[in-house]
């Protein structure tokens, strides 16, 4: 079975690498535009130059192309805590990231939010905070992990998952109560 190719891929595959087939004349292969530029006019004939123009401010192309328009630069999303790591240039999109001691959580492929790295209070750092992953904490005895924070077992309700981790404490509390009866 031949894999299905889109129209553009079909047209490009007829020409050597770095060239594309002229949309009005499939016997002509035009040179693609360099990154940082876009296609203003197709080449008029074989061996003749493609008319490529530089992207305007606020737009870019990151690879060789035959796009009729440059792509709009991304904006870092302040409401998601994002900060600009490097600004957009004609050949590279804006790079957004998080502040120091924060990590990225991807809600979807193209949307991330910055959150503070957990400090593991009442526990120890099992794995340090990374660019795309929060600190992994191990809690001290008498504490259990809830939403990546070490919470006292005194806050453990019987119906919660923490009962296994806090069982000795729960039994101790029960034992103390029992020993108080006469």
């Amino acid at each position: 079975l031949v894999p299905h190719l889109g129209d553009r891929e079909k047209r490009d595959s007829v020409c050597p690498q770095g060239k594309y087939i002229h949309p009005q004349n499939n016997s002509i292969c035009c040179t693609k535009c360099h990154k940082g530029t876009y296609l203003y006019n197709d080449c008029p004939g074989p061996g003749q130059d493609t008319d490529c123009r530089e992207c305007e401010s606020g737009s870019f192309t990151a690879s060789e192309n035959h796009l009729r328009h440059c792509l709009s630069c991304s904006k870092c999303r302040k409401e998601m805590g994002q900060v600009e790591i490097s600004s957009c240039t004609v050949d590279r999109d804006t790079v957004c990231g998080c502040r120091k001691n924060q990590y990225r959580h991807y809600w979807s492929e193209n949307l991330f939010q910055c959150f503070n790295c957990s400090l593991c209070l009442n526990g120890t750092v099992h794995l340090s905070c990374q660019e795309k992953q929060n600190t992994v904490c191990t809690c001290h005895a008498g504490f259990f992990l809830r939403e990546n924070e070490c919470v006292s077992c005194s806050n453990c309700k019987k119906s919660l998952e923490c009962t296994k981790l806090c069982l000795p404490q729960i039994e101790n509390v029960k034992g103390t109560e029992d020993s108080g009866t006469t």
């Epitope: 302040k78 409401e79 998601m80 959580h105 809600w107 939010q113 959150f115 939403e147 990546n148």
Partner: nanobody, 119 residues
């Protein structure tokens, strides 16, 4: 106490439209980024759209871009989702939520409203 209550769901034919609303109370609505997420039958939560407090530069998932419009009325403490050109794959329970700030989980979200797209 934070309360979020969605309405406007229902059965609609492919290509049809619906407008979802989310009434908010118990917090300063005008200061918060608001989110629409959805859960299709047997699937996980999907981020649909969000809108910052000032309503500028909303975000849309690629799957709904050009078809859905998020908006808000800060004077009415209400969030909206206008859904046009609906497809079968938009069938889901739609929830409004406050943008999380402590970690990647939703502390506050509504009970949801079911949108069914079927002929």
């Amino acid at each position: 106490e934070v309360q979020l209550s969605e309405s406007g769901g229902g059965l609609v034919q492919p290509g049809g439209s619906l407008r979802l609303s989310c009434a908010a109370s118990g917090f300063t609505f005008a200061h918060e980024t608001m989110v629409w997420v959805r859960q299709a039958p047997g699937k996980g939560l999907e981020w649909v759209s969000h809108i910052p407090p000032d309503g500028q530069d909303p975000f849309y998932a690629d799957s709904v871009k050009g078809r859905f419009t998020i908006s808000r009325d800060n004077s009415k403490n209400t969030l909206y989702l206008q859904m046009n050109s609906l497809r079968a794959e938009d069938t889901a329970v739609y929830y409004c939520a406050l943008l999380p700030n402590r970690g990647p989980w939703f502390d506050y979200w509504g009970q949801g409203t079911l949108v069914t797209v079927s002929s």
